[in-house]
């Protein structure tokens, strides 16, 4: 038997278990937590990954400046419901009965209510900005090579079709990735803007959620990039809906 | 679909050399670690030899240091195992590996997603 045969696992996800009783003893994986099968040959939904982590035991160049609808992914981890497909659920409950509304990358887009709260649609985020410091360089890194290296790494690593890779702005050590994508431009089988964010933000953290025990080694022209501050800002196709009393907070 | 095709097996006698090549038909080769894993007859897949994407970083078996030795030509999406003073317990199915791109890997077969099927080395007087 070959070498191929004996890493039944899963490259993009070690979220998951997996056995070859696939199709002609093909390798099959289910994420953990949910039990859905996975495709192992792109990217996880965030929905799934969220759950698969709350069931594992606890253990010019100018810069942007994120529009005022901008959502912050302030609540952090919970165990969200996903639909069939693995896609955050619009509406999302707790063990005691609180919900509110999320965007499609699980961030909450409404105030905290009760079951009676009605979430009509799963609204799009469209529009994501990751916001990077990088640790000290002796120098600046080249702009042209530091852009070609982040659309490179989300073709790649992420799988994300070059197109929805809007910009990279760099004014050292700031850096921002710009993703966009339209629910009229994401065609079947495109990896969705918000979990490349997730995978990113999780490679940045030093938790990879590839397979192996190994984590994200970028570098530009051979120069380690090693970030030391990472923001993500979301912005929805639709505004988000909070009260006055939490803007003014 | 990345595709690892090797070459360079043989039979050869114990003390002599061998090269094997691992062409790698992925565009993603240059952002990838390679690797080289043997399995000897009856025994389990070991880790050989890791080179780093940059090739400033290799790693090697305690079994074939000082004695192997890996790099790789990014312009030719190839990577090499130089193989000396070669030992009959060397005889192996040998196959190279690809990580993950932009994925760090050691010796370990699971830090590995794409593999060649293998070439035979057989090491005999």
């Known amino acids: 038997h070959t070498a191929a045969q004996d890493n039944c696992t899963c490259p993009t996800n070690k979220m998951t278990v997996c056995s070859p009783d696939g199709p002609g003893g093909r390798c099959q994986c289910r994420a953990l937590g949910s039990g859905m099968a996975v495709d192992c040959s792109t990217l996880t939904s965030k929905c799934l990954l969220l759950k698969a982590r709350m069931s594992a035991p606890k253990n010019a160049r100018t810069l942007v400046r994120p529009s005022e609808h901008a959502l912050v992914d302030n609540d952090g981890l919970y165990d969200p419901d996903c639909d069939p497909e693995g896609r955050f659920k619009a509406r999302q409950c707790n063990q005691t009965s609180v919900c509110w509304c999320v965007n499609s990358v699980g961030v909450r887009r409404t105030d905290k209510g009760d079951l009676s709260l009605r979430c009509d649609e799963l609204v799009r985020t469209h529009h994501i900005l990751i916001d990077l410091r990088h640790r000290p360089t002796a120098g600046a890194f080249n702009h042209s090579d530091l852009d070609a290296e982040l659309r490179r790494l989300f073709r790649e690593r992420y799988r994300l079709h070059p197109k929805f890779v809007a910009a990279v702005h760099y004014e050292q050590p700031t850096i921002q990735i710009e993703l966009r994508q339209n629910t009229s431009q994401k065609a079947a089988g495109d990896v969705d803007i918000g979990d490349a964010a997730y995978y990113f933000e999780r490679d940045i953290k030093g938790e990879s959620l590839f397979q192996g025990r190994g984590g994200l080694d970028l570098r530009v022209r051979g120069e380690p990039l090693q970030v030391e501050r990472t923001l993500i800002y979301y912005l929805d196709e639709i505004p988000p809906k909070f009260s006055m009393k939490r803007l003014t907070a | 679909e990345v595709q690892l095709l090797e070459s360079g097996g043989g039979l050869v006698q114990p003390g002599g050399s061998l090269r094997l090549s691992c062409v790698d038909s992925?565009?993603?080769?240059?952002?990838?670690?390679m690797g080289w894993f043997r399995r000897a007859p009856g025994k389990g897949l070991e880790g050989v030899s890791v080179i780093s994407p940059y090739g400033d970083s290799t790693y090697y078996a305690d079994s074939v240091k000082d004695r192997f030795t890996i790099s790789r030509d990014n312009a030719k999406n190839t990577v090499y195992l130089q193989m000396n003073s070669l030992k009959p317990e060397d005889t192996a199915m040998y196959y190279c590996?690809?990580?993950?791109?932009?994925?760090?890997?050691?010796?370990?077969?699971?830090?590995?997603?794409?593999w060649g099927q293998g070439t035979l080395v057989t090491v005999s007087s």
């Open positions: 590996a690809a990580s993950w791109p932009y994925q760090t890997a050691s010796l370990d077969a699971m830090d590995f997603t794409d």
């Open positions: 992925g565009s993603t080769y240059s952002r990838r670690y």
